[in-house]
């Protein structure tokens, strides 16, 4: 239904707290360099204006669209051109072009310092002094670093943060209470960020149809007892919610997500038997819980997929009649039978089925042509299964850090032109798949591994798009989203690459490395490893292991030495010489 004032409607639906949080996220995601105070001032102005419209929907400007209202606010910021360069040109445009322009200027890799967590005591003090401002800072800092973070989900993580601080700041040992809990939230939030970015990429590059196919597969796996009409309705609603969030329409997105959660909880009988626990929770927790609810039990009496999609005489007629509906039904039926497959794999199978029908239905004897299609799925299924087995075996043998290093070597060989920080970040993220997925039961490994890898590789593609340097990466990133992971996996050593010359300073370290936290030490060592591979792309695993063991030994020795500086300055050059010899 149409509302006289959109902003009043959203304020009423969402309530002041969520309204303010979402407006803050929106502004922080659009203008990523502005300080918290600048954004907080704008948020207050927008909120005061919304309240005016709630009191009188006919008041001046209350009938304007949210894009117009928010865009006007952003464009009124002083020194916009000085701080944001060509983004200021967006302000010369009219809506909807102005919002599109803002979206195009979102930076997936803003040059902001890493978000450092304050020391426990200081954190608790500022939290107790002003919890609202504290949480505002959290939303601002996360949103500006992750401009596509799923806004209602970020509100959920802020709520988690709040609960942890409330609990731990009352403890005697605040540090040991806070650290593991906040680390857990951070890890989950980072995964949520790359997953959502993947959804927005799907929407931006391939449109709503591609996202809806993803949603149909995912929902069919989770709700195998829901019928196709129900799954289609949920997929359509979910597509709308994600389209809004990816498009910067965060108030509409959060409102529609709440509506979808309400619908699901009111229609549990036709959706799933597993929703009740989620539905008992308050809004943010409920929506989060529903998004990762366990799969319902599969119906016992499902007929073989071949009956309707291979053996039926009407296959081509049904396909001709309504291609998207028929393919959607295939995707639904296949996905509900395979919770053990990744969504990417299910979409590849649906694509293969579509291509087969396109080819076979044009022939004089279609059934003879498409009769073997299910057998042709086999290699497509085996490839990711082998990937999971090989990588989980390697992870179990090497542990997370060693596994990250193995991936780093592999990916540096595939795309040595990519910057070392990007390679290290990608390898560290890809390597986490082991900890995240390889410990799961067998039937959950494949979906966990492949869908996580796809999301991480999407980030690699986004970063590479800004400065394209590798033909290998460009080739894999240009294809469809579901083909990316197999494409990257299939890449081998880039034979066109001219090795980097050996620079001693790249492998020169100082005593300050000794006081770094373990994570930072690892990054330093992994940076050196990537540089070694760039110098010798065809170095054997054995050679690289020798050098890295030597390097680890060197750090261990010098960091334990009484005179660390002397140790580094005398032993460092010896290490460099040994490295060169080992790789010669």
């Amino acid at each position: 239904e149409a509302h006289k004032s959109e902003i009043a409607h959203r304020y009423n639906d969402l309530g002041e707290q969520h309204f303010k949080g979402l407006v803050l996220i929106a502004f922080s995601q659009y203008l990523q360099k502005c300080s918290y105070d600048e954004h907080a001032k704008l948020v207050q102005e927008v909120t005061d204006f919304a309240k005016t419209c709630v009191a009188d929907e006919s008041a001046a400007n209350c009938d304007k669209s949210l894009h117009t209202l928010f865009g006007d606010k952003l464009c009124a910021i002083p020194n916009l051109r000085e701080n944001y360069g060509e983004l200021a040109d967006c302000c010369t445009k009219q809506e909807p072009e102005r919002n599109e322009c803002f979206l195009q200027h979102k930076d997936d890799n803003p040059s902001l310092p890493p978000f450092e967590r304050p020391e426990a005591e200081a954190m608790c003090t500022s939290f107790k002094e002003n919890p609202t401002t504290f949480m505002g800072h959290y939303l601002h800092e996360v949103a500006r670093r992750h401009p596509y973070f799923y806004a209602p989900e970020l509100l959920y993580y802020a709520e988690q943060y709040n609960e942890i601080l409330t609990q731990c700041c009352a403890e005697a040992d605040k540090e040991s209470c806070l650290t593991p809990k906040l680390d857990g939230v951070k890890e989950k939030a980072l995964v949520s960020s790359v997953r959502q970015r993947m959804k927005c990429s799907s929407m931006q590059k391939f449109g709503e149809r591609a996202f809806k196919a993803w949603a149909v597969a995912r929902l069919s796996q989770t709700f195998p007892n829901a019928d196709f009409a129900e799954i289609t309705k949920l997929a359509t609603d979910l597509t709308k919610v994600n389209k809004e969030c990816c498009h910067g329409d965060l108030l509409e997105c959060a409102d529609d997500r709440a509506e979808l959660a309400k619908y699901m909880c009111e229609n549990q009988a036709t959706i799933s038997s597993k929703l009740q626990t989620c539905c008992d929770k308050p809004l943010l927790k409920k929506a989060h819980c529903l998004s990762e609810v366990e799969h319902d039990t599969m119906p016992a009496d499902l007929p073989a997929i071949a009956a309707d999609f291979v053996e039926d005489q009407e296959v081509c007629k049904n396909y001709a009649e309504a291609k998207d509906v028929f393919l959607g039904t295939f995707l639904y039926e296949y996905s509900r039978r395979h919770p053990d497959y990744s969504v990417s794999l299910l979409l590849r199978l649906a694509k293969k089925y579509e291509a087969t029908l396109e080819k076979c239905c044009a022939e004089a004897n279609p059934p003879a042509c498409y009769g073997t299609v299910l057998a042709e799925f086999q290699p497509l299924v085996e490839e990711p299964k082998n990937l999971v087995k090989t990588n989980c075996d390697l992870y179990e043998k090497l542990g997370e850090y060693g596994f990250q290093n193995a991936i780093l070597v592999r990916y540096t060989q595939k795309a040595p032109q990519v910057s070392t920080p990007t390679l290290v970040e990608a390898a560290r993220n890809l390597g986490r798949v082991g900890t995240k997925c390889c410990t799961l039961p067998e039937d959950q490994r494949l979906p966990c591994v492949e869908d996580y890898l796809s999301a991480i590789l999407n980030r690699v593609c986004l970063l590479h798009e800004k400065t394209p340097v590798s033909e290998h990466v460009t080739k894999c990133c240009s294809g469809s989203l579901v083909e990316r992971r197999p494409c990257f996996s299939a890449l081998t050593v880039d034979e066109t690459y001219v090795p980097k010359e050996f620079k001693a300073e790249t492998f020169t370290f100082h005593s300050d490395i000794c006081t770094l936290p373990e994570k930072e030490k690892q990054i330093k060592k992994q940076t050196a490893l990537a540089e070694l591979v760039k110098h010798k792309p065809k170095a054997t695993a054995e050679q690289l292991k020798t050098v890295m063991d030597d390097f680890a030994q060197f750090l261990d020795t010098c960091c334990k030495a009484a005179d660390k500086d002397t140790c580094f300055s005398t032993e460092g050059p010896n290490l460099v010489t040994r490295c060169k010899d080992a790789l010669a």
């Epitope: 009407e314 007629k317 001709a320 396109e358 044009a362 022939e363 004089a364």
Partner: nanobody, 115 residues
Framework: EVQLLESGGGLVQPGGSLRLSCAAS????????MSWVRQAPGKGPEWVSS????????AYADSVKGRFTISRDNSKNTLYLQMNSLRPEDTAVYYC????????SSQGTLVTVSS
């Protein structure tokens, strides 16, 4: 919505000829192989002939080979069946189908071969 409309049937003497047409709409005609199927009174459906989407590939039931010719005009979204040397046993309702289906989804056109 897919629609198939057959025409051209009628009463013909043994040894005579008829040309059946099937006008198609509601789908990308050129992308689909098409067939002619017939059903004699009191009998099940019988496949007669098929043609690929491009028209380059055709197939016939042994009972009509050498007498019937299937063709198509993709610019007109129309399928044809030229029937020569007709016999009484060719009497049936003839209907066109998409992609080798034997199921009837149209009215069909009645062909009666009788002296």
């Amino acid at each position: 919505e897919v629609q198939l409309l057959e025409s051209g049937g009628g009463l013909v003497q043994p040894g005579g000829s008829l040309r059946l047409s099937c006008a198609a709409s509601g789908f990308t005609f050129r992308s689909f192989g098409m067939s002619w199927v017939r059903q004699a009174p009191g009998k099940g459906p019988e496949w007669v002939s098929s043609i690929s989407g491009s028209g380059s590939d055709t197939a016939y039931a042994d009972s009509v080979k050498g007498r019937f010719t299937i063709s198509r005009d993709n610019s007109k979204n129309t399928l044809y069946l030229q029937m020569n040397s007709l016999r009484p046993e060719d009497t049936a309702v003839y209907y066109c189908t998409i992609g080798g289906s034997l199921s009837r989804s149209s009215q069909g056109t009645l062909v009666t071969v009788s002296s």
